[in-house]
Amino acid sequence: SPVPFGPEGRLEDKLHKPKATQTEVKPSVRFNLRTSKDPEHEGCYLSVGHSQPLEDCSFNMTAKTFFIIHGWTMSGIFENWLHKLVSALHTREKDANVVVVDWLPLAHQLYTDAVNNTRVVGHSIARMLDWLQEKDDFSLGNVHLIGYSLGAHVAGYAGNFVKGTVGRITGLDPAGPMFEGVDINRRLSPDDADFVDVLHTYTLSFGLSIGIRMPVGHIDIYPNGGDFQPGCGFNDVIGSFAYGTISEMVKCEHERAVHLFVDSLVNQDKPSFAFQCTDSSRFKRGICLSCRKNRCNNIGYNAKKMRKKRNSKMYLKTRAGMPFKVYHYQLKVHMFSYNNSGDTQPTLYITLYGSNADSQNLPLEIVEKIELNATNTFLVYTEEDLGDLLKMRLTWEGVAHSWYNLWNEFRNYLSQPSNPSRELYIRRIRVKSGETQRKVTFCTQDPTKSSISPGQELWFHKCQDGWKMKNKTSPFVNLA
């Protein structure tokens, strides 16, 4: 079992040693300056009060300095994500100092004990930063702490204890258990750095959540609602990763935050955007695709500092792998029914045709229920950049497509047996691109033919009349 540690966070090495060295104590936290992109390279170990390694290892006092802080570990080894992140930081910021905070001895414990050690590790990082601040040209404003899971709260403590204010802290799916709902001084919070951005990827809304659910930064980003990440479903982990265990599924979702951050470093040309929204349900309904008043932002490394915001919840959809970027669209569809068939819940699909590419058949997800004789809002997203939208095809799935729909059809028939021929009228669809903020209105090809029934399709083209909205491009997208 792990070696005991003292209250000052020092690890007593009480192993097989000669008497003379029996009292030797070692710091429980090590700082490894990664001097090479080669993951096998041993790097340089820095320690407070010893300036020689800074010179020997070419520590750049004027450059950005990243501290990567791992979380709880069951194996006691650095996991594979770590050298991926180191490499990505070196690729993006060639002159930067990349320091790995090795607190493995204190993290390789029971989870509760590891949690109790976070404060001591935060203190160690703060002491290192205080010492570096004594050096000429070193600025705390250039320091970026990146903490994964439990490491995010370690970063919070470090930011809290340091003399001055750290430039930035990024929390990568900060740990939930023992941190959810606690006082701001005992977890990551916006007060811990000049800018605190957080990615939440495994926040279950029921039971024990591995990642913290509550917002803890200036901006808190919840990719895919912050819970079920594409590519991490049970079928995915059995199929593509061939992991096949619940723990690997958990790991996949929890670790996704790291990969989203790495993606933001290495795929600069494909930045992912998140949109401010009060909750995941509203986002899924397509209500929150606005970039006005700083309501959207890049995610990960490219996030723009928003000091005025606190605990601002932001959402986006992603792909299952790198590059994670998708293209979001809000569809506003006015559905009219002469039959007043209130229980009609059609299974609708849309295909978008663009100047660059065409989308797949995209489902219009009904988050609550479709309101008839009203405007319904939907969110759809594509993995490819379609370019300018030219036309679209709306399809109402027929009875034969699925057992679920067969049941729906049967239920609808029971509720209104006198009127089995259900029909909806849709004259136009208003589309807004989340990424470009452009709005376009599409009308049915033939104004006299705007009805659709199960198993049928309806084509829409850019409106020729005054329904076409002005093209508005947010200046935000130029920041990408």
Partner: antibody
Framework: QIQLVQSGPELKKPGETVKISCKAS????????MNWVKQAPGKGLKWMGW????????TYTDDFKGRFAFSLETSASTAFLQINNLKNEDTATYFC?????????????WGQGTTLTVSS | DIVLTQSPASLAVSLGQRATISCKAS??????????MHWYQQKPGQPPKLLIY???NLESGIPARFSGSGSGTDFTLNIHPVEEEDAATYYC??????????FGGGTKLEIK
């Protein structure tokens, strides 16, 4: 140059204890983890576990929990494998091998091996 | 635990010909574009020696006639052209994230 030098062959009786050493040179001992690998006569390689040479925390695989103990003498850059209550099936060659903490955890340098024979 | 199955258990190859050894994992050993599969050579009375790391990277000092390929669950070690000194037992090993790390059963290569 980097070297891992292990102690010489051992002949033991069942129930006894053996302690095998692995002395490292040519690199900073505490900057790399140390593995132990067992190879029974005419058989393949079996990973026993590893020890964090900085913290001294050992990790054992399920088959090697109980009678086996990894330890260190950091000042002498030496790792130890101790096997208590020896059994006939412990007869094997034992290798130490280092790996990088930060990389892909392959074993880049190996000791020459220590042959242990357990026989009554 | 990830089980590695090597085939064939033994093979005899003529001098100058190609030797191909396969290693199949019970589940993927890939991680974010990297394969955590490594190959070792062991001669009688000697410790194993690292040949290939991360599926296809040649360890320094190893002759270029050794090459590795594969991803996911299927990996291959190729030796071409085979030389006399290549007679040995070859092992694959996976180190994908959390231990236990495991070795394949080994393939004995004889030179005809």
């Amino acid at each position: 140059q980097i070297q891992l030098v292990q102690s010489g062959p051992e002949l033991k009786k069942p129930g006894e204890t053996v302690k095998i050493s692995c002395k490292a040179s040519g690199y900073t001992f505490t900057n790399y983890g140390m593995n132990w690998v067992k190879q029974a006569p005419g058989k393949g390689l079996k990973w026993m576990g590893w020890i964090n040479t900085y913290s001294g925390v050992p990790t054992y695989t399920d088959d090697f929990k109980g009678r086996f103990a990894f330890s260190l003498e950091t000042s002498a850059s030496t790792a130890f494998l101790q096997i208590n209550n020896l059994k006939n099936e412990d007869t094997a060659t034992y290798f130490c091998a280092r790996f990088s903490y930060y990389g892909r955890h392959y074993f880049d340098y190996w000791g020459q091996g220590t042959t242990l024979t357990v026989s009554s | 635990d990830i089980v590695l199955t090597q085939s064939p258990a033994s093979l005899a190859v003529s001098l100058g010909q190609r030797a191909t050894i396969s290693c199949k994992a019970s589940q993927s050993v890939d991680y974010d574009g990297d394969s955590y599969m490594h190959w070792y050579q062991q001669k009688p009375g000697q410790p194993p020696k690292l040949l290939i790391y991360a599926a296809s990277n040649l360890e320094s000092g190893i002759p270029a006639r050794f090459s590795g390929s594969g991803s996911g669950t299927d990996f291959t070690l190729n030796i071409h052209p085979v030389e006399e000194e290549d007679a040995a037992t070859y092992y694959c090993q996976q180190t994908n994230d959390d231990p236990p790390w495991t070795f394949g059963g080994g393939t004995k290569l004889e030179i005809k």
